[in-house]
Amino acid sequence: MNGRVDYLVTEEEINLTRGPSGLGFNIVGGTDQQYVSNDSGIYVSRIKENGAAALDGRLQEGDKILSVNGQDLKNLLHQDAVDLFRNAGYAVSLRVQHRLQVQNGPIGHRGEGDPSG
C-alpha cells in the first residue's frame, strides 16, 4: 500500500538586509505565469550563494512569499512582483509560507511500540 503525502504549512517573518551582493534569490509566479496551478502566488525559485537570503539561511526554494514590507503579493503580474522587490529598499521584511512534505506510512494498523513513522 502506498503512503500518503501530507504537507505541514508554516508561516515565518524573515527580515533581510540587501547587502552588496543583493538579496540573492529569484521568484516565479504571478497572475500571468502561474507556477502552481490555480495559484497566482509568488514562489522562490532559486537562492543564490553569497546573497543575503543564502547567508541568512531561513528562506528556502519553493517557499511562497505572501508579502514584502507588509505589501500583499496577491494578484500581481510577475513583473509587478519583481518591481516590488527591486524597489523595497535595503531593509526587506518577507512574510513567507514554508510547505514541508510529511511522508505518512502505509494506511493500516501499526502495532504499539512501532518506532517507524
Partner: nanobody, 124 residues
Framework: QVQLVESGGGLVQAGGSLRLSCAAS????????MGWFRRAPGKEREFVAA????????DYSDSVKGRFTISRDNAKNTVYLQMNRLKPEDAAVYYC??????????????????WGQGTQVTVS
Amino acid sequence: QVQLVESGGGLVQAGGSLRLSCAASGRSFSSLDMGWFRRAPGKEREFVAAISGSRGSTDYSDSVKGRFTISRDNAKNTVYLQMNRLKPEDAAVYYCAAGFGSVDGLEYPISYDDWGQGTQVTVS
C-alpha cells in the same frame, strides 16, 4: 540555461564607436533581463547597462550614460550595446549576462544566471 555569444569588440580610436552584440539561445528570450558588464585589467567587474525583459526598461552606469545605448531585438534573440564617444577608460573585456525573476536590481551581478565569454574592446 541560456547560451550567450558576444561579438563586435575590437580596436577603436578614442572618440570612435563600436556596437557589441550578444546572441542568446536556450529559453524564451523576450522575458529575459539582459545586462552588459565589463572588467578592465586589475579592476573589479563593473556594471555598464541593462534592459529588462517584460517592460524593456533600461538602466546605465553613470560612467556611460549619454554615450552608450542598450537595446534588444526579441525576434533575433539579440541584445546590443551601442558605444559612442569611446574613451581610453572604456577599454575592457565586455560580458553579456542573462537572468530571469531576480528580486535584485539589474546592476547587481547576482541578478544574472548565465554569462557569455566576453569580447575585448581596446581604445587607443
